[in-house]
């Protein structure tokens, strides 16, 4: 019997593996080399949403398309090879931090050149799957003494990214200490990323089980065919019904001018590592993507003068000596962005039980996505929080951090 891979169906250097097909026959599965994807590796990734970087390796949107930002010592489109290694070599090694949920990595002589020793409660080649374990009464303490020193260093250390370690002290969860702190069902953080409906976790406090119970056959993400179009046409004053869906960000409320606003409580505050002028240049894209992730409508909060509340975020000064600050203007390394959440269309949709009632719950959800490495957002977020509503600040106010 001819192998289904005989015809070399995988393009662009993709690896073909025979796999069970319908009716008991054989078909093939292509394992694509980055940045290619699709059933035959025939498509080129144009956004980080389409590019699968190795676990722990962030994706960066560059002028030449999405790229995996490889850790030191690894290179290649998938961060799988050492500099100078032959094409096709697949030395993933432990440098890419492939082991999830506190698992420790050991080098191995055969591909994929690592083995994971999983923390309690996790299984799988990368410790990616919850082990079938009895419900525990509380989460384990942080198993690694080294994690204490790494907390709050603004780098997500994968081996400390577990609830017991406080998601590396918030470094892996956008500084949200525990996104699931309101959730009474203890294991919901384990089930958040399993793409299955877990009814015990579908409450607002448990972050709607990552919308697993709500999807109900609906698209989870905006159709890539529409995505760029919907970002371009977001809040442009024209109603585009193709973009007027929760997964595409409700077209920036272009189709809802007659529907009264329904603001969630508080303000969603994000620190984005892009200066204000750069962020504002792509504001429609930024807001559309974030609205799509949260499945509701986001917009900038306006100050008393009607200006968007996007303030410069300065590099924290070591020791914060006042003299040094006077001598050198602090470097602007990002923006503090204040957003309003408008649930007018979320609450009008047929399944209207999945809207974020306040900014903090939206912040928790973003923190949870980040903690389980599912935050598909091309703008570099440093932290996120919900704040109670205060009177709008005057436009000359600047945030100093």
């Amino acid at each position: 019997v001819l192998s289904p891979c005989e015809s070399q169906p995988c393009q662009h250097g993709g690896q073909c593996r025979p796999s069970p097909g319908p009716g008991g026959g054989l078909t093939f599965t292509c394992h694509c080399a980055q940045p290619f994807w699709g059933p035959r590796c025939e498509r080129v990734a144009r956004s980080c949403r389409e590019l699968q970087c190795p676990v722990g390796v962030p994706c960066q949107q560059t002028p030449r398309g999405p790229r995996c930002a490889c850790p030191p010592g690894l290179s290649g489109p998938s961060c799988r090879s050492f500099p100078g290694s032959p094409p096709g070599a697949s030395n993933a090694s432990c440098a890419a931090a492939p082991c999830l949920h506190g698992g420790s990595c050991r080098p191995a002589p055969l591909a994929p050149f690592f083995r994971c020793a999983c923390a309690q409660g996790w299984t799988g080649p990368r410790c990616e799957a919850p082990a079938a374990a009895p419900e525990v009464s509380e989460e384990p303490r942080c198993p690694r003494a080294a994690c204490q020193a790494k907390r709050g260093d603004q780098r997500c250390d994968r081996e400390c990214n577990s609830p017991g370690c406080g998601w590396d002290g918030g470094d892996c969860s956008l500084s949200v200490g525990d996104p699931w702190r309101q959730c009474e069902a203890l294991q919901c953080w384990r089930l958040f990323n399993n793409s299955r409906c877990d009814p015990a976790c579908s409450s607002p406090a448990c972050l709607y089980d990552n919308f697993d119970c709500h999807a109900g056959g609906r698209e989870r993400t905006c159709n890539p065919v529409y995505e760029k179009y919907c970002a371009d046409h977001f809040a442009d004053g024209r109603c585009d019904q193709g973009c007027n869906t929760e997964e595409c960000g409700w077209d920036g409320l272009d189709c809802a001018s007659e529907v009264p606003a329904l603001l969630a409580r508080g303000v969603l505050v994000l620190t984005v590592l892009l200066p204000p002028e750069e962020l504002l240049r792509s504001s429609a894209d930024f807001l559309q993507r974030l609205s799509a992730i949260l499945r509701t409508s986001l917009r900038f909060r306006l100050d008393a003068h009607g200006q968007a509340m996007v303030f410069p975020y300065h590099r924290p000064s070591p020791g914060s000596e006042p003299r040094a600050r006077r001598e050198l203007a602090p470097e602007v390394i990002g923006s503090v962005v204040m957003l309003e959440i408008d649930n007018r269309l979320c609450l009008q949709s047929p399944e209207n039980d999945h809207c974020f009632p306040d900014a903090q719950s939206a912040a928790d959800y973003l923190g949870a996505l980040s903690a389980v490495e599912r935050l598909d957002f091309p703008y570099p977020l440093r932290d996120v929080r919900g704040e109670p509503l205060e009177p709008p600040e005057p436009s000359h106010h600047h945030h100093h951090h």
């Epitope: 371009d232 977001f234 809040a235 442009d236 004053g237 024209r238 109603c239 920036g252 272009d254 189709c255 809802a256 001018s257 504002l280 240049r281 792509s282 504001s283 429609a284 930024f286 807001l287 917009r299 900038f300 306006l302 009607g306 200006q307 968007a308 996007v310 309003e340």
Partner: antibody
Framework: QVQLVESGGGLVKPGGSLRLSCAAS????????MHWVRQAPGKGLEWVGR??????????DYAAPVKGRFTISRDDSKNTLYLQMNSLKTEDTAVYYC??????????WGQGTLVTVSS | DIQMTQSPSSLSASVGDRVTITCRAS??????LNWYQQKPGKAPKLLIY???NLQSGVPSRFSGSGSGTDFTLTISSLQPEDFATYYC?????????FGQGTKVEIK
């Protein structure tokens, strides 16, 4: 009633600058995307650019012939849209209209203001 | 940029005639096409939006059709007040662009 009134047009020399204003009344100006469109004497309509509401970043887009020379801005506290025109050329001579885009296409246009660029 | 080409550039017709103006886009614009009417010294007036939707207050003798790249404006029975210049405009992608116009004159 809903109204847009342009002002600031006039005669200017090539290389000079001019700022057009568009005063809005009868609607909540701050929530609308606003456009500038121009029409050279005896010619067709040409889209100049647009600006989004400040709640969505107030970002502006421009047509290629004016990009880098013209700047669209808005002052929601004054219900006014602006078009700052620098490095003017003779081919910028036109009637300039401001227009309100609306989701359900109830468009509103001003009466236009004439800009003449001539030495 | 998306180019919009209207034809004819001008036409002569009599009251009661059926008039058809076509507009072609240089690439697909789905149904993101608007038709405007302009009379001398006046601002343009929106007649048809999203290719086939009649703007409120516009007489039903005006109709629009088409999608993708080819579009048509039809006036089923020309009236004296319809003598004007008609423009198509795409708002699919910035920069938004207009056709060069079709002048409808009295025969």
């Amino acid at each position: 009633q809903v109204q847009l009134v342009e002002s600031g047009g006039g005669l200017v020399k090539p290389g000079g600058s001019l700022r057009l204003s568009c005063a809005a009344s009868g609607f909540t100006f701050s929530t609308y995307v606003m456009h500038w469109v121009r029409q050279a004497p005896g010619k067709g309509l040409e889209w100049v650019g647009r600006i989004r509401a400040n709640a969505y970043g107030g970002a502006a887009d421009y047509a290629a012939p004016v990009k880098g020379r013209f700047t669209i801005s808005r002052d929601d506290s004054k219900n006014t849209l602006y078009l700052q025109m620098n490095s003017l050329k003779t081919e910028d001579t036109a009637v300039y209209y401001c227009a309100r885009a609306e989701a359900r296409y109830r468009d509103v246009w001003g009466q236009g203001t004439l800009v003449t660029v001539s030495s | 940029d998306i180019q919009m080409t209207q034809s004819p550039s001008s036409l002569s017709a009599s009251v009661g005639d059926r008039v058809t103006i076509t507009c072609r886009a240089s690439q697909s614009i789905s149904s993101h096409l608007n038709w405007y009417q302009q009379k001398p010294g006046k601002a343009p007036k929106l007649l048809i939006y999203a290719a086939s939707n009649l703007q409120s207050g516009v007489p039903s003798r005006f109709s629009g059709s088409g999608s993708g790249t080819d579009f048509t404006l039809t006036i089923s029975s020309l009236q004296p007040e319809d003598f004007a210049t008609y423009y198509c405009q795409q708002d699919y992608h910035t920069p938004f662009t207009f056709g060069q116009g079709t002048k409808v004159e009295i025969k």
